[in-house]
């Protein structure tokens, strides 16, 4: 039985060049958190194993930073890393739980962070 | 080359014990999470155990807790599947498998299989 | 416990046919779905994950989609090779769970 849910920053936006944290918050559940995968559209960005530790996908490791917590950092951000985002949770014993967080980039100073949100 | 070779199967009485042995080779034993998969006579397959890469956690489907034990040796390259309180529903090939690091419950890679009778 | 229904259980085509094997999971999985192919007397080998990726080293005549509760995967101009029993898996909830698998014989 899943009962948990998945927080997240929800819709956010960031400055070209700058650095953004992507958040995910796992509650109201006891299941033990064994992974965290941190993926844009279908690719792999980052994992959090709870025995390994980080890995950064070979591709992403100069503009990706693990942390805070279970969080991932984007740094140098350009335009193109603008799109959505996914925490995957992997726990036992509940299973798969997917947070989404929609990143803007922008080319001006106007970035603003948006709601929190909930996903069950 | 992936290579999973499992031993230790045999014909067992109901309620009797038997130790199940995978030695690994061809990959970093100590980063995957490895599993065992039994196929039925009938040629179902059914998961039952995963240990985590560092042995940390260990997860099973309830038709088999509190009688099956999966640990591992990282030193020695191999995977355990002690089995105790056999039953006839238990009967099946064994199949060891390494699971894909980025997706826990994906089994990339299975080996030969070793086989379990449990008859009177 | 999810339960994976695969359709049909067998399957009979020929050669150069396209074929769909169908896999229903009883709540909804999301994209979390492996589809494993088993030759006769072989062991099982992993072909497709998160419902539409292929494996490394699987021929592209194979393909694999859906979410939620539907999934599908497809074999383009079948060869005498994918003569074979499939299993899809779904990977979003404990206890991890297995269709009862789709033979295809060749006409």
């Known amino acids: 039985m899943m009962t948990g849910t998945i927080e997240t920053t929800g819709n956010i936006s960031a400055e070209k060049g700058g650095s953004i944290i992507l958040q995910c918050h796992l509650s109201s559940t006891t299941a033990q958190v064994t992974q965290v995968n941190w993926e844009q559209q279908d690719q792999l960005l980052a994992i959090c194993n709870a025995d390994l530790g980080w890995h950064i996908s070979p591709s992403f490791k100069d503009r990706v930073a693990p942390g805070p917590g279970l969080g991932l950092t984007l740094q140098s951000l350009t335009v193109n890393d603008t799109g959505e985002y996914f925490c995957i949770y992997h726990t036992y014993p509940d299973g798969t739980y997917t947070g989404r967080i929609f990143l803007e980039v922008l080319e001006s100073s106007v970035a603003e962070h948006g709601a929190r949100f909930q996903i069950p | 080359e992936v290579k999973l070779v499992e031993s230790g199967g045999g014909l067992v009485k109901p309620g009797g014990s038997l130790k199940l042995s995978c030695a690994a080779s061809?990959?970093?034993?100590?980063?995957?999470?490895m599993s065992w998969v039994r196929q039925t006579p009938e040629k179902r397959l059914e998961w039952a155990a995963t240990i985590s890469s560092g042995g940390s956690y260990t997860y099973q489907p309830d038709s088999v807790k509190g009688r099956f034990t999966i640990s591992r040796d990282n030193a020695r390259n191999t995977l355990y599947l002690q089995m105790s309180s056999l039953r006839s529903e238990d009967t099946a090939l064994y199949y060891c498998?390494?699971?894909?690091?980025?997706?826990?419950?994906?089994?990339?890679?299975w080996g030969q299989g070793t086989s379990v009778t449990v008859s009177s | 416990d999810i339960q994976m229904n695969q359709s049909p259980s067998s399957l009979s085509a020929s050669l150069g046919d396209t074929i769909t094997i169908t896999c229903h999971a009883s709540?909804?999985?999301?994209?979390?779905l492996s589809w494993y192919q088993q030759k006769p007397g072989n062991i099982p080998k992993l072909l497709i994950y998160k419902a539409s990726n292929l494996h490394t080293g699987v021929p592209s005549r194979f393909s694999g989609s859906g979410s939620g509760t539907g999934f599908t995967l497809t074999i383009s101009s079948l060869q005498p090779e994918d003569i074979a029993t499939y299993y899809c898996q779904q990977g979003q909830s404990y206890p991890w769970t297995f269709g009862g698998g789709t033979t295809l014989e060749i006409k």
């Open positions: 061809g990959f970093d034993f100590s980063r995957y999470d």
């Open positions: 709540q909804n999985i999301n994209v979390w």
């Open positions: 498998a390494r699971q894909d690091y980025r997706y826990p419950y994906i089994m990339d890679y």
